[in-house]
């Protein structure tokens, strides 16, 4: 009897949908695997007789519940199928946005770039998929614990009237208010402000 794949899960970030599993202990030899998806009531092969322990399902439609399954095989024997259901638009992890930061005197000027999507045109981003897409920004004075959060209305934001000659750190994430779903934070970007632009009297 061939044992089934173990720890079967979907690892999906920005609609790059990778079904992953672990090979079970099997004394007779090396196992291969077949992974399938349900399409119009018929299971279709996606990865056949692979020695890998993952299979790319990024070409699935983004909406709808998908049934995926994987089994282990050895010679003419095979395990039972292990099934999972997956809805990309609900289940995919929202990766960190890109961010450009520029210092102008005592202000930080930030521009945000929504994450790109696997198997899409360059300009079709996560912002196009989710109508309610917005950004959360948090910033803090480097070396302090107190963080301030803002929700920009646009793809850019300016933090004004900051302390001169002080290093501030900023990070951004995508947020979907209608789903109350937050994405991953970007890596902090830390920049030092320069002088206060106000002219002395």
């Amino acid at each position: 009897m061939v044992p089934p794949p173990e720890n079967v899960r979907m690892n999906s970030v920005n609609f790059k949908n990778i079904l992953q599993w672990e090979s079970p202990a099997f004394a007779k030899g090396n196992l291969t695997f077949t992974a399938q998806y349900l399409s119009y009531r018929i299971f279709q092969d996606k990865c056949m007789n692979t020695t890998l322990t993952e299979c790319d399902f990024s070409s699935l439609s983004k909406y709808g519940d998908h049934t995926l399954r994987v089994r282990a095989e050895f010679a003419d024997e095979h395990s039972d199928w292990v099934n999972i259901t997956f809805c990309p638009v609900d289940d995919t992890i929202i990766g960190p946005p890109g961010m450009q930061v520029e210092v102008l005197a005592d202000s930080l000027h930030m521009r945000f770039l929504a994450p790109k999507i696997e198997n899409e045109y360059e300009t079709w981003t996560m912002k196009n998929v989710y109508n309610s897409w917005t950004y959360n920004v948090q910033y803090w004075k480097n070396g302090t614990d107190e963080k301030f959060q803002i929700t920009p209305q646009y793809d850019f934001e300016v933090l004004r009237n900051l302390e001169p000659w002080t290093t501030y750190c900023v990070q951004v994430r995508g947020f979907l208010p209608d789903r109350n779903k937050a994405g991953e934070w970007s890596e902090p970007v830390c920049e030092q402000t320069t002088h206060d632009e106000t002219v002395p009297s």
């Epitope: 909406y63 300009t123 196009n128 109508n131």
Partner: nanobody, 124 residues
Framework: EVQLVESGGGLVQPGGSLRLSCAAS????????IGWFRQAPGKGLEGVSC????????HYADSVKGRFTISRDNSKNTVYLQMNSLRAEDTAVYYC????WGAGCKSEADYDYWGQGTQVTVSS
């Protein structure tokens, strides 16, 4: 059931232009995303362009960027694909597709309704 009807295909010389149209028969083209795809002889389906109803944004495959323009005329319930500087490699059957959800642009899996296609041949 929605029926999409493409028109405007034909034979054109390299460097020439064509304008394809996509209309919904007896229905409004009121879908979040309308896309154009093409299938060259012996090849798979390839995404060409799409237009989003929510913000009017347009998106293109690298192979057609700067040469093709997608647009929509809501008063005529029609989406157009203006194709300029045509090349032999643009020869294909061109399909219009509509998405109910508007989540995707390039992948055929994200579209729900399809037209029958119109042939475009670029040859001298």
């Amino acid at each position: 059931e929605v029926q999409l009807v493409e028109s405007g295909g034909g034979l054109v010389q390299p460097g020439g232009s064509l304008r394809l149209s996509c209309a919904a028969s007896g229905n409004s083209l009121d879908y979040p995303t309308i896309g154009w795809f093409r299938q060259a002889p012996g090849k798979g389906l390839e995404g060409v362009s799409c237009i989003s109803a929510s913000d009017g944004s347009t998106h293109y495959a690298d192979s057609v960027k700067g040469r093709f323009t997608i647009s929509r005329d809501n008063s005529k319930n029609t989406v157009y694909l203006q194709m300029n500087s045509l090349r032999a490699e643009d020869t294909a059957v061109y399909y219009c597709a509509a998405s109910l959800w508007g989540a995707g642009c390039k992948s055929e899996a994200d579209y729900d309704y399809w037209g029958q296609g119109t042939q475009v041949t670029v040859s001298s």
